[in-house]
């Protein structure tokens, strides 16, 4: 006999929630795998800056995305299937996974806060790297897309360390159009904006992390309530 009333409502809420979670995981995994195997991105990964090899931030970032996507799909599936099948075993596993993910998020948050300067440095290096690839090999559309994403997201263009050749390309091709950035190229320094993001705007990342944590706690509660409901309904 299935669950009834409020518990039934929780069952479908958990199903819908985790189906969306599973889909999002699939999208992230797909994009990450495409980035990993796309030849132009591979060029970016093996790019050298001067006599120094490129930072492995991007490489690590792609593998983190693959892991995040896979975990999201797995956890989403557990929640989805566990809810619709009313399986205590699957819901118990789902709950355990959420506890582990919650612990990972807290650990990642602490690590990120402690290492924010290094992360900011790596992000700046990655931006420089993408910019170099976009100028030298202008067929590298991924590199251009990365640069444009930086520019549009952070509302910046270039950095004070640029060469004249890069500046020419930025002014004419890679700066956000229709903005006053081109005339204030070095005032809207992307390196400065990245630093600001990791210091002044850290609270935004914190809020995002708290929102994710609250959703996780909410899902944990729902899965436990549903689990108890299933147990109780099987008693009668």
């Amino acid at each position: 006999m299935g669950v009834e009333g409020c518990t039934k409502c929780i069952k479908y809420l958990l199903f819908v929630f985790n189906f969306v979670f599973w889909l999002a995981g699939g999208v992230i995994l797909g994009v990450a795998l495409w980035l990993r195997h796309d030849p132009q991105t591979t060029n970016l990964l093996y790019l050298e800056l001067g006599d120094k090899p490129a930072p492995n931030t991007f490489y690590v970032g792609i593998y983190i995305l693959i892991a995040v996507g896979a975990v999201m799909m797995f956890v989403g599936f557990l929640g989805c299937y566990g809810a619709i099948q009313e399986s205590q075993c699957l819901l118990g596993t789902f709950f355990t996974c959420l506890v582990i993910l919650f612990a990972c998020e807290v650990a990642a948050g602490i690590w990120g806060f402690v290492n924010k300067d290094q992360i900011a440095k790596d992000v700046k290096q990655f931006y420089d790297q993408a910019l170099q690839q976009a100028v030298v090999d202008d067929d590298a559309n991924n590199a251009k897309a990365v640069v444009k994403t930086f520019h549009e997201t952070l509302d910046c263009c270039g950095s004070s360390t640029l060469t004249a050749l890069t500046t020419s390309v930025l002014k004419n091709n890679l700066c956000p159009s229709g903005s006053n950035i081109i005339s204030n190229l070095f005032k809207e320094d992307c390196h400065k904006k990245i630093d600001e993001l990791f210091s002044g705007k850290l609270y935004l990342i914190g809020i995002a992390a708290i929102v994710v944590a609250v959703i996780m706690i909410f899902e944990m509660i729902l899965s436990m309530v549903l689990c108890c409901g299933i147990r109780n309904s099987s008693v009668y």
Epitope: V136, D138, T163, S168
Partner: antibody, heavy 123, light 110 residues
């Protein structure tokens, strides 16, 4: 041997058109930015235009903007300069040159030059 | 009128050291690397020095380049008769792109 060979020069009337070609050998044209530079006989060098490896970024000197068009066909290993609305002051030897870009996108000059082709604009 | 200023002429006797200057502004020479070219009579220019002071392979070490502030210099030591040519400095400027100096005609005397 790395070489550039220009062709297409000649005598043309003012207002006329001419298309210069530059064939590359000994290297893959598609891996390099390329430029056209001109020199009035007995005078100094004047940069005309530059084009990036896949034609995404193109630059012109103010004196030729709107009249000249730089292009390339990487499959044919050839660089072009289409010259329209030619004037007497465009009379010069036109050189095509390979642009050298160093680490961290530093412009390291024009490291390979063709022998040049003479364009004479006269009525 | 070039934005990079070179002396129109320079001269020296064989074995002597000759220096050719190239002066610009903070927006071109001051913030970018300079390249030097040699153009022998009746031939195409040849890259002599790139990135302020680097020599391409095949260029004798008698040729050296340096830059200080908004002035670049090309030095030729142990001058030879075959060094008689026109010399040009050049930079990539972010606004006017490839910019050449007016050129210096080097004459080897005697």
């Amino acid at each position: 041997e790395v070489q550039l060979l220009e062709s297409g020069g000649g005598l043309v009337q003012p207002g006329g058109s001419l298309r210069l070609s530059c064939a590359a050998s000994g290297f893959t044209l598609g891996s390099y930015w390329m430029s056209w530079v001109r020199q009035v006989p007995g005078k100094g060098l004047e940069w005309v235009s530059s084009i990036s490896s896949s034609s995404s970024y193109i630059y012109y000197a103010d004196s030729v903007k709107g009249r000249f068009t730089i292009s390339r066909d990487n499959s044919k290993n050839t660089l072009y300069l289409q010259m329209n609305s030619l004037r007497a002051e465009d009379t010069a030897v036109y050189y095509c040159a390979r642009q050298r870009i160093g680490d961290l996108v530093v412009h390291y000059g024009l490291d390979v030059w063709g022998q040049g082709t003479l364009v004479t604009v006269s009525s | 009128q070039s934005v990079l200023t070179q002396p129109p002429s320079a001269s020296g006797t064989p074995g002597q050291r000759v220096t050719i200057s190239c002066s610009g502004s903070s927006s071109n020479l001051g913030s970018n690397t300079v390249n030097w070219y040699q153009q022998l009579p009746g031939t195409a220019p040849k890259l002599l020095i790139y990135g302020n002071s680097n020599r391409p392979s095949g260029v004798p070490d008698r040729f050296s380049g340096s830059k200080s502030g908004t002035t670049a210099s090309l030095a030729i030591s142990g001058l030879r008769s075959e060094d008689e040519a026109d010399y040009y400095c050049e930079v990539w400027d972010s606004d006017s792109y490839v910019t050449f100096g007016g050129g210096t005609k080097l004459t080897v005397l005697g």
